[in-house]
Interface confidence: low
């Protein structure tokens, strides 16, 4: 099927950036792994690289706003031609759930006290308003709440006084039009507006003040400009040369608003300055190998001695990764393929044990199923040998430094008649639906 | 972590000696060992001369007698004083530091300086 073939994919919004052009097939999109590609506008944007999990998403509210409750968020699969971790197939969702506390206790509703005594009238003459107030007090309100109803009120007060009304213009009224809308006619063109004193009148009983300054105004009209002249296109120009190498790329004809030049204050031509076509160079795009992530250690060996293990004797190891999707003559992975370090084995020795303290709570799990549950652990944590801060070695190689290497047998006293993990499980509470955030949007 | 700088290298005759010198900076105080490694072309990196904070010190048989290594805590410098130079010392030489307490250890390389013995 034809998608719309991008030129960027941004990774923090997971958005396509750079619109190439519809049309094509999705391989002929992804020939170049740096472009991303939409089924459909607005939907799920891919990149083409190959497949490998978005950053996780912010946390989503709490799923209530006070006490305990839960948290979602998830991360996709994102990428073509390929597999996540896990062998999960581009386009799939993985959640997270977590327990969340925005507030430890919920708003109380508080009691009003009784209503204080009344202000003074608002003004001195004529009616006007007077307030009176009471406290949130009766009892407080707790933990953010509020009083329910207003804490003032207010009634209308008549000072049985006559207040002086002073005049005020009302508003000027529109200017009467200019005789001409051109410059250069026969008469020189004049505009007039005028205003009445009544916004409002000024009273008779008592004496208002009249309105300061003139009722019309008279003024000549300038600046007239000359009459307009709408602007032309003039002819495309030739095609651009195609700007890539390798995939798809754009080309570009232009034209130019001069047939005529728009005048005066003439419209601008209507339409595109420029149009784009793709174009296809049918050579896939080089790329780069990157780094696997290191392999295991080795184990910790020392030559010509057949074991080292639980011995205050250092040997070596190392470990090595590969570099993989080199294609198309893209760059070679930089740096060292092979790491090596000096170690002690501890690889099954028996050492003593203590108990940790309690790890934090874990994640919900599982996070869109079922009654989730976290859990917290102590474990059976093995006392490491302390060795001497400098080895004699043998002749030629000096002192050593060294690294524990293996899974030593640790050794606690039962607790809770366990020996090596003590679990404590607890179920999340609140939990809300895990609905596809793409899906949310349409 | 601990960054070291080789100085001192260059080009000599056979027979002449020279001095080469790595500076430490960083968590110094932490360092248990210190040691002069060197590679030649097409060949693995091979221990020349170690020297513990105590003051104990080892070095390879081939050089034996001819070069000495020595560490100023003060000045958190560890120099190799090279004699008797021979064609087979050509190398890159590299300073080594090695932290280590009982729950493991970490060891910090130079960039590397260039010996060159002709004759």
């Known amino acids: 099927d034809p998608v719309l073939c991008f030129t960027q994919y941004e990774e923090s919004s997971g958005k396509c950036k750079g619109l190439l052009g519809g049309g094509v097939s999705v391989e002929d999109c992804c020939l170049n792994t740096a472009f991303a590609y939409q089924k459909r506008s607005g939907g799920l944007c891919q990149p083409c690289r190959s497949p490998r999990w978005s950053l996780w998403s912010t946390w989503a509210p709490c799923s209530v706003t006070c006490s305990e409750g839960s948290q979602l968020r998830y991360r996709r699969c994102v990428g073509w031609n390929g597999q996540c971790s896990g062998k999960v197939a581009p386009g799939t969702l993985e959640w997270q759930l977590q327990a969340c506390e925005d507030q430890q206790c919920c708003p109380e509703m508080g009691g009003w006290s009784g209503w204080g005594p009344w202000e003074p009238c608002s003004v001195t003459c004529s009616k006007g308003t007077r307030t009176r107030r009471r406290a949130c007090n009766h009892p407080a309100p707790k933990c953010g709440g509020h009083c329910p109803g207003q804490a003032q009120e207010s009634e209308a007060c008549d000072t049985q006084q006559v207040c002086p009304t002073h005049g005020a213009w009302a508003t000027w009224g529109p200017w009467t039009p200019c005789s001409a809308s051109c410059h250069g006619g026969p008469h020189e063109p004049k505009e007039t507006r005028s205003r009445k004193c009544s916004a409002p009148e000024p009273s008779q009983k008592p004496p208002g003040k009249p309105c300061p300054g003139l009722a019309y105004e008279q003024r000549r009209c300038t600046g007239l400009p000359p009459c307009p002249v709408a602007g032309g296109w003039g002819p495309w120009g030739p095609v651009s040369p195609c700007p890539v190498t390798c995939g798809l790329g754009q080309t570009m004809e232009q034209r130019t608003c001069n047939h005529p030049v728009p005048q005066h204050g003439g419209p601008f031509c209507a339409g595109d300055a420029t149009r784009t076509h793709i174009c296809n160079t049918a050579v896939p795009c080089p790329v780069d190998g990157e780094w696997d992530s290191w392999g295991e250690w080795s184990p910790c060996i020392r030559r010509n001695m057949k074991s080292i293990s639980c011995q205050e004797i250092p040997g070596q190891q190392s470990r090595g990764r590969t570099c993989r999707g080199r294609k198309f003559d893209g760059h070679r992975c930089a740096g060292q393929q092979q790491d090596i370090r000096h170690c002690y084995s501890i690889q099954h020795c028996p050492l003593k044990g203590s108990w940790s303290e309690w790890s934090t709570w874990g994640l919900c799990m599982p996070p869109c199923g079922p009654n989730p549950t976290r859990a917290r652990q102590r474990l059976c944590t093995p006392l490491l040998p302390k060795y001497p801060p400098t080895v004699s070695m043998v002749e030629g190689q000096g002192e050593k430094n060294v690294t524990f290497w293996g899974r030593p047998l640790p050794r606690c006293e039962e607790l809770q008649g366990q020996k090596l993990v003590v679990e404590e499980k607890r179920p999340c509470l609140h939990v809300p639906a895990c609905k596809d955030p793409e899906e949310e949007e349409l | 972590q601990v960054q070291l700088v080789e100085s001192g290298g260059g080009l000599r005759q056979t027979g002449e000696s020279l001095r080469l010198s790595c500076t430490a900076s960083?968590?110094?105080?932490?360092?248990?060992?210190m040691a002069w490694y060197r590679q030649a072309p097409g060949k693995q990196r091979e221990l020349v001369a170690e020297?513990?904070?105590?003051?104990?010190?080892t070095y390879a048989d081939s050089v034996k007698g001819r070069f000495t290594i020595s560490r100023d805590s003060a000045k958190n410098t560890v120099t190799l004083q090279m004699n008797s130079l021979k064609s087979e010392d050509t190398a890159v030489y590299y300073c080594?530091?090695?932290?280590?307490?009982?729950?493991?250890?970490?060891?910090?390389w130079g960039q590397g300086t260039q010996v060159t013995v002709s004759g």
């Open positions: 080594n530091a090695l932290q280590y307490d009982r729950y493991g250890g970490a060891e910090y």
């Open positions: 960083g968590r110094i105080f932490e360092v248990n060992m």
């Open positions: 020297i513990s904070r105590v003051g104990t010190t």
